[in-house]
């Protein structure tokens, strides 16, 4: 016998969906209505069909009293070829649940969003989480999602975007996102870094990631940040091949006042960078290739500093290679 | 070990009505999702009509609006009243339970509907 595509767990708390038949029993899913946690995976179905059985039109007040008996906060919807007026669809349902946190992984969103009708109530998520998710509509998608969304967003996720650049003239703000994570977009760099920081658009972050970026110096970065208005007080740059020196043409950066934590590991750092800010409270340089102790005017004043992992902390360790092993001593970087 | 026992089918006139119960049995430590399915002869097993441990329910296309499924106060217990019977809903019913690792399915009650 085929085992069962979906699984609840004994607390009805988590429940996985993996549908893997070509015409699969979506009636399977329904076991997750009473979980708080759903993950469903369609592997990598065209949901067209859907929209033959569904009124994607229909008022979806209709459905409020049993979207409202729902448990759902945390929602994971992957693998599919989705048309944008069934995921529409869905948001219009799912703002009379009490969901609050939507990662859609691995997704091609086909078609055009429609604009969010007048009487409709959009989405009271407090974290987005997009991976791999293509979108018809290239640029303008974040601002077409967006209209479907109530303003109180907190957390933003978006890693292997096939567009990580956003048209942000049509972006409205986002005035209460405190963490915004755009790791993973090797290909995004310092200049798409300026025009995925829409100008003002992200006033209130407090957390910027930037991990696996393609980023190349922390000035470069800073500039970025600048140019944007975005004032982190923890910004991570870990797993970017990082230079330690500076561009001598390049203006220097004055960082905000307000970062006061500082991820540089896994750098590749042979020395401390320069164009440093002045003060932090963190700083993490574990995992690079420092062979000689940092001296204090290399610097920031810094009240935590985390050095581990580097060749100078064991003596007669050649730079560290990917898949080298060490020592005991040094944590596997 | 859970048991399912499926009871209430039997044979009725096309138009007429039945009701089918099912009692879950054996080591069950919470209200889970229940559901009755049914298979007619040569064809593929189909959902019926499910019921959420918190009484949310869906049905199958061809029995909404005729077919209620509903729980007892018993903590496992399914009931599904079927009103307006057709032959096309000539099948053995099935009462299945959800559960963690492996799902419990009863035996089927066979239920004719006679034109």
């Known amino acids: 016998t085929t085992p069962e595509p979906c699984e609840l767990d004994d607390e009805d708390f988590r429940c996985v969906c993996n549908f893997s038949e070509p015409q699969p029993d979506w009636s399977e899913a329904f076991q997750c209505v009473s979980a708080v946690e759903v993950e469903i995976h369609a592997g990598g179905l065209n949901l067209e069909p859907f929209l033959k059985r569904v009124d994607a039109d229909a008022d979806p007040r209709q459905y409020a009293d049993t979207v409202k008996a729902l448990r759902v906060r945390r929602l994971t919807v992957g693998a599919a070829q989705v048309p944008a007026q069934l995921l529409v669809g869905a948001l219009r349902v799912l703002a009379y649940s009490r969901l609050k946190e939507l990662t859609l992984e691995d997704l091609k969103i086909t078609g055009t969003m429609p604009p969010l009708p007048l009487e409709a109530t959009g989405l009271a998520l407090s974290s987005l989480r997009l991976r791999n998710v293509s979108w018809a509509t290239g640029r303008s998608w974040l601002a077409e999602l967006q209209q479907w969304l109530k303003p109180g967003l907190k957390v933003l996720s978006i890693a292997q975007a096939h567009s990580p650049a956003f048209s942000c003239e049509q972006v409205r703000a986002f005035p209460a996102l405190t963490s915004l994570d755009l790791s993973d977009n090797p290909g995004l760099g310092e200049r798409g870094l300026m025009a995925a920081l829409c100008p003002h658009k992200f006033p209130a972050i407090q957390n910027l990631a930037l991990r696996n970026t393609g980023m190349e110096t922390p000035t470069g970065v800073c500039a970025a940040l600048a140019a944007a208005g975005v004032q982190p007080h923890s910004l991570d740059l870990s797993h970017n091949s990082l230079r330690a020196t500076v561009n001598p043409s390049a203006p220097r950066c004055m960082w905000s006042s307000a970062l006061n934590s500082l991820n540089l590991s896994f750098a590749g750092l042979e020395q401390v960078p320069k164009g440093l800010p002045a003060k932090l409270r963190v700083l993490d340089l574990s995992c690079n290739r420092l062979n000689r102790a940092p001296q204090p005017d290399e610097l920031p004043e810094v009240d935590n500093l985390t050095l581990d992992g580097n060749p100078f902390l064991v003596p007669g360790t050649a730079l560290p290679h990917e898949g080298s092993m060490n020592s005991g001593v040094v944590p596997a970087c | 070990q859970v048991q399912l026992q499926e009871s209430g089918g039997g044979l009725v006139q096309a138009g007429g009505s039945l009701r089918l119960s099912c009692a879950a049995s054996g080591r069950i430590f919470s209200i889970r999702p229940m559901g009755w399915y049914r298979q007619a002869p040569g064809k593929e097993r189909e959902m019926v009509a499910q019921?959420?441990?918190?009484?949310?329910?869906n049905y199958g296309d061809s029995v909404k609006g005729r077919f209620t499924i509903s729980r007892g106060n018993a903590r496992n217990t399914v009931y599904l009243q079927m009103n307006n019977l057709k032959p096309e809903d000539t099948a053995v019913y099935y009462c299945?339970?959800?559960?963690?690792?492996?799902?419990?399915w009863g035996q089927g009650t066979q239920v004719t509907v006679s034109s």
């Open positions: 299945r339970l959800f559960k963690t690792g492996a799902d419990s």
């Open positions: 019921i959420s441990s918190s009484g949310i329910t």
